[in-house]
């Protein structure tokens, strides 16, 4: 599972007029991390774990970066010709990742009124546009605006993603929080299903990092993929994650089934409660 930093910026227009503010959130490893407080011109940590990641840092450069990015996105929205009456939004999502082999990936996506219309792979400098005619028109608008100073744009995007990766590395290097290992709490529950069957659910919560194996076993052998139902691995708001796996079994055979969990080199098995 790579480490990632994800910037999500949104600007709004009303009746063709671009609004002065912008919304910005930053996610670190999928967790809400920073939010831009527009009134105070400050990037604010989201919750205690985010504060712990950087301790007593002021977030001064994060604040300035987000403010500059918001201004850029407002200018981009001003160049979209498609704006009719009412409320419209332009959203930019930038993601940079550092993988276990130290390779990096950076991408950027633009959405208009919630619809994806332009993506860029920063490494390959390749732009992708969905097939719809609206997306094509919007993409042409934005690409033309960005290409007005093509070299500056190219440099700008490479610098932006270099900054993203630099920030991510700084967070990873400086933070004990991101290097910690928090084992999951595993809880198995059962609920009655139809015709002598029961549904057994295995929940893992409050674990870090995100990588986890959670699967049902019968007589010590993992069940096939299609007989199990998995939940997404989701942030729980405390800098840790949660997930679940469920399967349906015959009543009376509970003792043959166990939930197998593997996380950060540790593993455990958990029986179905009787």
């Amino acid at each position: 599972e790579p480490h990632s930093l994800r910037y999500n910026l949104t600007v709004l227009s009303w009746d063709g007029s671009v609004q002065s503010g912008f919304l910005a959130e930053v996610h670190l490893d999928g967790q809400p991390f920073l939010r831009y407080d527009r009134q105070k011109c400050r990037a604010k940590p989201q919750g205690q774990w985010a504060e712990d990641v950087l301790g007593n840092k002021t977030w001064d450069r994060e604040t300035r970066d987000l403010t500059g990015n918001g201004k850029d996105l407002r200018m981009t929205l001003a160049h979209i010709k498609d704006q009719k009456e009412g409320l419209h939004s332009l959203q930019e999502i930038r993601v940079c990742e550092i993988h276990e082999d130290n390779s990096t990936r950076s991408s950027q996506h633009f959405y208009y009124d919630g619809e994806l219309f332009l993506s860029q792979n920063v490494e390959t400098e390749e732009w992708t546009v969905p097939q719809s005619s609206r997306a094509q028109t919007l993409a042409m608008n934005v690409r033309n605006f960005l290409k007005e100073d093509a070299m500056k744009t190219k440099t700008h995007y490479h610098a932006m993603h270099a900054d993203c990766l630099q920030e991510l590395r700084r967070y990873l290097e400086s933070s004990v929080v991101l290097r910690r290992r928090v084992p999951p709490m595993v809880n198995v529950t059962r609920s009655e299903a139809s015709e002598g069957n029961i549904t057994v659910t295995c929940r893992a919560s409050s674990f870090y990092p995100r990588n986890i194996t959670l699967t049902w076993r019968q007589d010590g052998v993992s069940l096939s993929h299609d007989t199990q139902q998995w939940g997404d691995v989701l942030p729980d708001g405390n800098g840790t994650y949660q997930t679940w796996v469920a399967t349906r079994i015959c009543q009376g055979e509970e003792q043959r089934f166990t939930c197998y969990m593997e996380h950060s080199g540790n593993h455990s098995t958990h029986p179905v409660p009787s």
Partner: antibody, heavy 117, light 107 residues
Framework: QVQLQQSGADLVRPGASVRLSCRAS????????MNWVKQRPGQGLEWIGM????????RLNQKFKDKATLTVDKSSNTAYMQLSSPTSEDSAIYYC??????????WGQGTSVTVSS | DILLTQSPAILSVSPGERVSFSCRAS??????IHWYQQSTNGSPRLLIK???ESISGIPSRFSGSGSGTDFTLTINSVESEDVADYYC?????????FGAGTKLELK
């Protein structure tokens, strides 16, 4: 143009608290943090803390947490700093300075505080 | 707290000379350094922000450079009005801190 007008020099008795004022004009007072900075005679600058006039959120240098209290009055565009139980160590010039992304872009003329019995 | 060490304490130069002020941080603060000038009996004035960004209204002879822990403020041709104390300030870590200053004198 941006101006920060600070109150006049103060001679205070040890232990008697003192309140300094900083009146802002020429910009939207509630949109910017206000810093307070201390400078002892012949010495360097020391950051005391900052306050945001919109809701009075404050960030204090821990060294001054029992010494300085920052407040604002939005109706008069004025920031205040109260110094409690002053001693000779608190004799200094105190500046208010407007914050711009953690830099201090406009400064008041300073208020001289002398603590003496 | 971040310690900012300014050197030398006093710089003595002739008008027209190029002069450099040094500021060293006790740990990596990226580019979060700002420079101020304070004339005798005056308030500080912001000269350079974020290591190298110029400030509107400040003469172009003032420039800044550096990142990480070592930073420099340069006046490329000193004028008599530049006689003052010069302070660096960091904004990367709470609390915000200033260097002890360098006094610029004319020979």
């Amino acid at each position: 143009q941006v101006q920060l007008q600070q109150s006049g020099a103060d001679l205070v008795r040890p232990g008697a608290s003192v309140r300094l004022s900083c009146r802002a004009s020429g910009y939207s007072f509630t949109n910017y943090w206000m810093n307070w900075v201390k400078q002892r005679p012949g010495q360097g600058l020391e950051w005391i803390g900052m306050i945001h006039p919109s809701d009075s959120e404050t960030r204090l240098n821990q060294k001054f947490k029992d010494k300085a209290t920052l407040t604002v009055d939005k109706s008069s565009n004025t920031a205040y700093m109260q110094l409690s139980s002053p001693t000779s160590e608190d004799s200094a010039i105190y500046y208010c300075a407007r914050d711009d992304f953690f830099t201090m872009d406009y400064w008041g003329q300073g208020t001289s505080v002398t603590v003496s019995s | 707290d971040i310690l900012l060490t300014q050197s030398p304490a006093i710089l003595s130069v002739s008008p027209g000379e190029r002069v450099s002020f040094s500021c060293r941080a006790s740990q990596n603060i990226v580019t979060s350094i700002h420079w101020y000038q304070q004339s005798t009996n005056g308030s500080p004035r912001l000269l350079i922000k974020y290591a190298s960004e110029s400030i509107s209204g400040i003469p172009s002879r003032f420039s800044g450079s550096g990142s990480g822990t070592d930073f420099t403020l340069t006046i490329n041709s000193v004028e008599s009005e530049d006689v003052a104390d010069y302070y660096c300030q960091q904004s990367n870590i709470w609390p915000l801190t200033f260097g002890a200053g360098t006094k610029l004198e004319l020979k």
